[in-house]
Structures are given as structure tokens and as C-alpha cells.
Interface confidence: low
């Protein structure tokens, strides 16, 4: 049966022993059966979602794979320095200046770390069976609007670590089956909903470390109805407007960390009713509109750490009943009180600027930091008991 512990203490698994919050998830086996160090990983949100997705993906992939796999090359003659196995072409670091020409039945083409500067019109058109295209770490600066025409079977496109500054509306028009689009570390300075025209099946869009200063004040997901994960980490976005995410009904994860956001429209997240993880860490947010999180009924992970937030309303988190992890690191909460966190009945992890704040969330098993960096464990325990 479940052990009942006083507020601020948590059970040692099925032992009838309770330990204070401080001794749980501190890296030491204080219970004697390691129960206080079990289930300490904060594996909510993004990572859990990815795990779930990968599990499904590999299940599907394994059922579709060839009965008897062969290592023979089935894409005809291949360029020097390229490797080939079955219908997969590996031309990584092959000193290529352009997309190679091989048999049209190729299913995987990896062209990483070459010297491809432009993607010309119809450069991949004949590869109608291509499922995965890797173009990371080239010198691509120009992408023709018809570069990806004909790639009807493509499910994964990697364009990271290039020099792309602009993607024309319609460049992805034919990619109706694309599920992953990764454009990390490029020089994109703007996007519009029409940039993503045709991406009916897109699930994951990663635009980390580009030069975006603003998001369109138009429905960004208009042409990406199945989008689950959207990552804008490391851009220069200044504000979040009310229309941007209006069509992102299926969004599960939104990562906006390490931007320059200083303004949040009160309705910025209103339509994100399936959102599981929201990361706004390391921005310039000073004010949180009172109702900013009110529609995020499914949210399990929220990070607003390292923002110059002046004040957190007492009822700021009241609607987040499913929240499991809350990151408030680097935030001075001058008006902190237990009332702020009490409605968060499912909260298992909380992260503060100061150890002393943990006393205001006594029902949360894992609270960091779990020392003040000075006092001994005995002194800390004594002060908790006194309190």
C-alpha cells in the first residue's frame, strides 16, 4: 500500500519510511534501497515525446524492411569516394561540387561535408523514391524554388550547417510526405507560412541557430497541419504575436529558448491545446501576461528560466494541473509563496535560483538546487525541521 508522508517528505518506495525533499534526488542513497534516487530523471516533455515517436518509427520501419537484406549496390555506378549499399548512397566527404547522378531508384542519399554551393532547379527531380536526403555541412547559399521538385517519397531532409539565407515560398511544395525538416545553423532571416507550403505530413521542424528576428504575424502552421515539434532555439526573435501559432493545433513541443523575446502577447499560446513542452528559457521576458498559460491544459514541462522576470503572479500557474516539470532558474521571485505552486498537483521536478525557494514547494519531490552551496547537510536539515 502507499506510504503516507507529511508535507515536505516523500516515501522510500514501499518502505514505511519518509525522507525530506532535500534528501531525494541528491545523488546519495539515503533510503538504503535507492528508492530516493529512483525516478529522478526529468524525462517529461521533449525527450519523452521523441522516445515515443522513435519507438513507433522503428516499429514501422522494421515491419517494412527487406526480408533478406543485401549489401550489393543497386543504384548503378557511383562517384569516386562514395559508398553504396542496396539502394543507399553515402557520399559524405567525397569532394563533391554538385549533386551526383545515380540511378533513380536510390532511397537514401547522404552528401554531408562536401562543397555543394547551390541547389539548382530540378536537381533531385528524378529521385522519386528518395526517402532520406542529407545535405549537412556543405556551403549551400542558394536553393532554387524548384530544387526539391519531384521528391514525392522524401520523409527526412537535413539542411543543417549551411549558408542558406532565404527559402522561397513553395520550395518544399512537392514534399507531401516529409516528416522531418532540419535546418539548423544556417542564415535564415525570415520565414512565412508559405515557406512551408506543401508540407502536409511534417512532424518535426528544427530551425535552431538561424538569424530569425521575428516570426510572421500570420498562421505559421497553415500548411503544416500535423506539426508536433517546432524548435526555434538560438535565433534573435523579439516577440511572440497572437496569430503566429493560431493554426498549430497539434503542436506538442515548442522550443523558443535563447532568443531575444521581450514581449509575449497574452494570446500567443491560446491555440496550443495539445502542447506538452514549452521552453522560453534564456530570453528577455520581463512581464508574463496573467493568462499567458491558461489554455495549456496538457502542458507537462515549462521552462521560463533565465529571464529578467520582475514578478510572477500568485495564480500564474493555476491552470497547469498536468505540469510535471517547472524551471524557474535564475529568477528572483520576490513575492514567492506556497500558493503559487500548490495547484501544480502533478509537479515532480522544480528548479529555482535559490535553495531557499524549495521550502515553498514542499509537495514536489525533486527540487533543485538542493543545497545552498555553503551549509552542511545537517544544518540544512535542521533549518528545514525548524521551519
Amino acid at each position: 500500500q502507499d506510504v503516507s508522508c507529511p508535507l515536505g517528505s516523500f516515501p522510500c518506495g514501499n518502505m514505511s519510511r519518509c525522507l525530506p525533499q532535500l534528501l531525494h534526488c541528491n545523488g546519495v542513497d539515503d533510503c538504503g534501497n535507492r528508492a530516493d534516487e529512483d525516478h529522478c530523471g526529468d524525462n517529461n516533455g521533449w525527450s519523452l515525446q521523441l522516445d515515443k515517436y522513435f519507438a513507433n518509427y522503428y516499429k514501422l520501419a522494421s515491419t517494412n524492411s527487406f526480408e533478406a537484406e543485401t549489401s550489393e549496390c543497386l543504384v548503378g555506378s557511383v562517384p569516386m569516394h562514395c559508398l553504396c549499399r542496396d539502394l543507399e548512397l553515402d557520399c559524405d566527404e567525397a569532394n563533391l561540387r554538385a549533386v551526383p547522378s545515380v540511378s533513380s531508384n536510390v532511397t537514401v542519399m547522404s552528401l554531408q561535408r562536401n562543397f555543394i554551393r547551390t541547389l539548382p532547379p530540378n536537381g533531385f527531380r528524378k529521385y522519386h523514391e528518395l526517402q532520406k536526403l542529407c545535405l549537412q555541412n556543405n556551403r549551400i547559399h542558394s536553393v532554387s524554388v524548384s530544387a526539391f521538385r519531384g521528391l514525392r517519397s522524401l520523409t527526412k531532409l537535413y539542411l543543417s550547417h549551411n549558408r542558406i539565407t532565404f527559402l522561397k515560398p513553395g520550395v518544399f511544395e512537392d514534399l507531401h510526405r516529409l516528416e522531418w525538416l532540419i535546418i539548423e545553423d544556417n542564415h535564415l532571416s525570415r520565414i512565412s507560412p508559405l515557406t512551408f507550403y506543401g508540407l502536409n505530413s511534417l512532424i518535426l521542424l528544427v530551425l535552431m541557430n538561424n538569424a530569425l528576428t521575428r516570426l510572421p504575424d500570420k498562421p505559421l502552421c497553415q500548411h503544416m497541419p500535423r506539426l508536433h515539434w517546432l524548435d526555434f532555439e538560438g535565433n534573435r526573435i523579439h516577440n511572440l504575436r497572437n496569430l503566429t501559432f493560431i493554426s498549430c493545433n497539434n503542436l506538442t513541443v515548442l522550443v523558443m529558448r535563447k532568443n531575444k523575446i521581450n514581449y509575449l502577447n497574452e494570446h500567443a499560446f491560446t491555440h496550443l491545446q495539445k502542447l506538452d513542452e514549452l521552453d522560453l528559457g534564456s530570453n528577455k521576458i520581463e512581464n508574463l501576461p496573467p493568462n499567458i498559460f491558461k489554455d495549456l491544459k496538457e502542458l507537462s514541462q515549462l521552462n521560463i528560466s533565465y529571464n529578467p522576470i520582475q514578478k510572477i503572479e500568485v495564480n500564474q500557474f493555476d491552470c497547469l494541473a498536468k505540469l510535471k516539470s517547472l524551471s524557474l532558474e535564475g529568477i528572483e521571485i520576490s513575492n514567492i509563496q506556497q500558493r503559487m505552486f500548490r495547484p501544480l498537483i502533478n509537479l515532480s521536478h522544480i528548479y529555482f535560483k535559490k535553495f531557499q525557494y524549495c521550502g515553498y514547494a514542499p509537495h514536489v519531490r525533486s527540487c533543485k538546487p538542493n543545497t545552498d552551496g555553503i551549509s552542511s547537510l545537517e544544518n540544512l536539515l535542521a533549518s528545514i525541521i525548524q521551519r
Epitope: 532554387s144 524554388v145 532565404f166 522561397k168 515560398p169 513553395g170 507531401h176 525570415r190 512565412s192 507550403y197
Partner: antibody, heavy 118, light 112 residues
């Protein structure tokens, strides 16, 4: 608001190249294709070609491939069409038109009348 | 090239009447992405053309609901339910599915 302002009427001698301009305002020139359309007096409309200002990619109607050259100057948000060796057949009103990605011309210039005459 | 044939060339109507213009393409104008990029434009005397209908049946913003488009494959129709004086001019169909893009020859809507 979006506007396409075309250059004024031109009278040129046969064989002397002419360059028509279309200045875009109210939107970012580099985001949309710019098209050019010909209309001879009392006749219908004829599509010449289009250019994407972000990288100057052009798509030209083969009928005009030796006649029209499309260019852009991003710094002045202006698209140009140069007509080489004009003849009386080239006398017409020429329109520039913005092509929305839903494949329609949503904004048009007011037109430039070109008269080729000796 | 895709030939767009419009009928009639001239359409005399009385104000308040219904008008119907037909446009036939010489081959299917379904784009490889599944959309049919068939548009209707109206050019009033001395003016640039204006978009009325795109993708066969979608009214462009600000276009009155008396204008409607229909059709598929190679046969398309523009209907004006009650003609008003401001509707007079030349109507062009246009296909933007296959390069080179092509216009119909035009239908002149005039008062009877």
C-alpha cells in the same frame, strides 16, 4: 499597401533596346515571383516570363527567350525587363504583376506603353 | 503550350441578368501537386487586369459573391449571377499550372 509602379510610356526606334522598370513597395520584393505580361493594342494578354528576385532565377516563355531579359535590383526593390531589337510587333502595353504562391497575380502595375516606330 | 479557348468572344447582357463564360483548355491543367491553377481576371477599359477567381472556384478577397467559378480537368465556367454596370469589361481565363502560362483570348461583357 502593396504597389507596383511602372515606368512611363516609351517611344523607341526599331532595333534600339529598351528597358522597362517596375518598382515594388509595401512588401519585400524578394519574397514573390515578378511576372511580365504583354498586351498588344486591342488584343489579349500574353505571359512573357517571371523572375524570383531572391536569386534571380527566371522562367521564360520560349517565345520570348531571345526578346526579353528579366533582371532585378534588390537594393531599389525594382524589377526590369529589357527588350532587345524591338520591332513594331513589340509595340504593346507591358504589365508587371506579382505572383502569389497560390499561383495567381494578385497585384498588377499600371502598365507601360511601348511604341516602336521610326 | 496549353491553349485556352474562351467562348463567347462577346457577351451582350442586360443589367441584372445572369452571365456565363466558358473556358476550355487543350489539355488537363491539374498541376503535379493536385491543384488546378485556373484563374479569372477582369480588365476594365484603360485599366490593368484584376483577379476575380483563383484555383477554379475561390473568390479573391473583395470580390462580390455574385461571381462564382466552377469546372475541372479541361472545362471551366465563370458565372455572374446578376450583372451590374461595374462588371463590364473583358474577362480572361488563365492557367498557371504549366509553363508557359497562358491566357484565354478574352470575352467582352457589354450592355445589350
Amino acid at each position: 499597401q502593396v504597389q507596383l509602379q511602372q515606368s512611363g510610356a516609351e517611344l523607341v526606334r526599331p532595333g534600339v533596346s529598351v528597358k522597362l522598370s517596375c518598382k515594388a513597395s509595401g512588401y519585400s520584393l524578394t519574397t514573390y515571383w515578378m511576372n511580365w505580361v504583354k498586351q498588344r493594342p486591342g488584343q489579349g494578354l500574353e505571359w512573357i516570363g517571371m523572375i524570383h528576385p531572391s536569386d534571380s532565377e527566371t522562367v521564360i516563355n520560349q517565345k520570348f527567350k531571345d526578346k526579353a531579359t528579366l533582371t532585378v535590383d534588390k537594393s531599389s526593390s525594382t524589377a526590369y525587363m529589357q527588350l532587345s531589337s524591338p520591332t513594331s510587333e513589340d509595340s504593346a502595353v507591358y504589365y508587371c504583376a506579382r505572383w502569389d504562391y497560390d499561383y495567381y497575380f494578385d497585384y498588377w502595375g499600371q502598365g507601360t506603353t511601348l511604341t516602336v516606330s521610326s | 503550350d496549353v491553349l485556352m479557348t474562351q467562348t463567347p468572344l462577346s457577351l451582350p447582357v442586360s443589367l441584372g441578368d445572369q452571365a456565363s463564360i466558358s473556358c476550355r483548355s487543350s489539355q488537363s491543367i491539374v498541376h503535379s501537386n493536385g491543384n488546378t491553377y485556373l484563374e479569372w481576371y477582369l480588365q476594365k477599359p484603360g485599366q490593368s487586369p484584376n483577379l476575380l477567381i483563383y484555383k477554379v472556384s475561390n473568390r479573391f478577397s473583395g470580390v462580390p459573391d455574385r461571381f462564382s467559378g466552377s469546372g475541372s480537368g479541361t472545362d471551366f465556367t465563370l458565372k455572374i449571377s446578376r450583372v451590374e454596370a461595374e462588371d463590364l469589361g473583358v474577362y480572361y481565363c488563365f492557367q498557371g499550372s504549366h509553363v508557359p502560362f497562358t491566357f484565354g483570348s478574352g470575352t467582352k461583357l457589354e450592355i445589350k
